[in-house]
């Protein structure tokens, strides 16, 4: 059946997402499978349901078990199962295998370690990071957003990395830790000055007023994993986020790897309900890496 394993430590927050995804507007009911008892939605409860999420604030060993979520659209009900296990805190530094998230590999050029499950929580930077239970200190380690970056990775950087953060719920704080292994691989990659595949420089795209249109900025940065490679759109030289027009939205960059090993990134600019004034804007596709910045400009014209 459609089920997912989740685990946590006693006295820490644990938030579990229903493995059966639905639109945010769909109603989700949660039940404790063993008793078929409904999970309350009131936030005053230690364990409560909040849409697609089931929250243990904090978790107890006795919470372990299978939880059923039923996602209800207007015409379909779909069921998922969350298999939750809450473990006692370990007295020593050792993190057992059953508490480990998936192993990630890094290389000299790409050493990002993402903090597992963090996107489910209401947390604020910075994260605390530990390797084999020792707090990470020194300029080689940079906690950035939800990941850790290690400069000049060496083979002895391999090990178990734990991220620790605080989840805030209605003014109350709860600790969360998550651990994953990091392995170091020797990667024969390279990076180049960005090459923009699309759009062509000074291209003009024909659009219909009132229609939707997409502009794709696609750039390649070399072979193998890239330490820094961003692709974004600008409007008249301004960031999309600074340009307060809700009709114009930029998608997060999608990584692509071609059969020839080229590492490329696509970022789509979505323009809804094209208006006359959109034809007056300059749309810049920007590709940036450690070698520098390349810019291609595209304009819109009426069909």
């Amino acid at each position: 059946k459609f089920s997912k394993q989740s685990w946590g430590l006693e006295n820490e927050a644990l938030i579990v997402r229903c493995p059966r995804q639905g639109k945010s507007s769909y109603i989700v009911d949660w039940y404790y499978s063993q008793t078929n008892k409904s999970i309350p939605t009131q936030e005053r409860n230690r364990v409560f349901a909040s849409g697609q999420l089931l929250k243990f604030l904090p978790a107890e060993v006795a919470d372990s078990g299978i939880y059923t979520c039923i996602v209800r659209s207007p015409t379909f009900n779909r069921t998922g199962y969350a298999n939750v296990t809450i473990y006692k805190k370990q007295p020593d530094c050792n993190v057992p295998d059953y508490l480990m998230y998936s192993t990630v590999s890094g290389s000299e050029k790409n050493s990002k370690i993402y903090c597992p499950t963090i996107d489910l929580y209401n947390w604020t930077a910075p994260l605390e990071w530990f390797k084999n239970c020792q707090a990470l200190q020194g300029s080689r380690y940079k906690a950035h957003k939800s990941f850790l970056v290690i400069d000049n990775v060496m083979t002895d950087d391999a090990g178990d990395y734990t991220c620790k953060f605080i989840h805030n719920e209605n003014g109350a704080n709860y600790s969360v830790t998550a651990t994953r292994s990091f392995t170091v691989k020797d990667e024969q990659g390279f990076s180049l000055f960005p090459v923009i595949r699309a759009p062509a420089h000074n291209e003009t795209k024909e659009v219909e007023i009132g229609e939707n249109t997409n502009l794709t900025c696609s750039a390649c940065f070399g072979k193998g994993a890239q330490f820094l490679a961003t692709v974004q759109w600008q409007l008249n030289g301004n960031k999309i986020t600074d340009f307060s027009e809700p009709r114009i939205q930029q998608e997060e960059g999608q990584n692509q790897s071609f059969s020839n090993g080229l590492a490329c990134v696509n970022t789509v600019l979505r323009i809804a309900d094209v208006k006359e004034e959109d034809l007056l804007l300059r749309y810049d596709c920007l590709a940036l890496n450690l070698h520098g910045l390349r810019r291609h400009t595209i304009r819109l014209s009426r069909k």
């Epitope: 059946k1 459609f2 995804q21 639905g22 639109k23 015409t75 379909f76 779909r78 069921t79």
Partner: antibody, heavy 123, light 107 residues
Framework: EVQLLESGGGLVQPGGSLRLSCAAS????????MIWVRQAPGKGLEWVST????????YYADSVKGRFTISRDNSKNTLYLQMNSLRAEDTAVYYC????????????????WGQGTLVTVSS | EIVLTQSPATLSLSPGERATLSCRAS??????LAWYQQKPGQAPRLLIY???NRATGIPARFSGSGSGTDFTLTISSLEPEDFAVYYC?????????FGQGTKVEIK
Amino acid sequence: EVQLLESGGGLVQPGGSLRLSCAASGFTFSIYDMIWVRQAPGKGLEWVSTIKGEGGGTYYADSVKGRFTISRDNSKNTLYLQMNSLRAEDTAVYYCARDPWSTEGSFFVLDYWGQGTLVTVSS
Amino acid sequence: EIVLTQSPATLSLSPGERATLSCRASQSVDDDLAWYQQKPGQAPRLLIYDASNRATGIPARFSGSGSGTDFTLTISSLEPEDFAVYYCQQYITAPLTFGQGTKVEIK
């Protein structure tokens, strides 16, 4: 009441092109994934292509990749299938259908289908 | 791609009898499997989703079971309008695939 109505089928020579349309009504078209499925005479069902809702991605069967293009016009509540370089084996009834769940990166069943439009590729 | 194999190709039964149709997947599809009914000259009609849930308006005599690679559609007591072709379909991943169909005909 949900309705899907295909049009644009007909007789076309091998190598030719055809554009199918599917007019949708009775639901908020823009938020749903839409699908083309075909059925050769006397044969089973074959998925052709999916276009995700909210301006999302497109997916194609290997047999039509590079020849067929799925698109939608949410302002007209219409789904399209542009078919180029047609072959005899593309001869089939083409159905448009709706995926009622439509979440990012996942697929579901087809709960409403049109009545189909026949495409015949023959010289 | 995931291949769905339906058996038997044809099932010859009388009204009132029980029909058992099988669908086997070449790899696990969890419970992401549907069953459709198609009558001559008509579009398919959704019967079962998520392996065992009846779609809205589908009579209780239709039931689905199974998970992983082996699935069954059961019609507990055939009505005259149930004689048709039945297809299974997986939707765990693209390409979406259908079985080749099982024809339920009147004996």
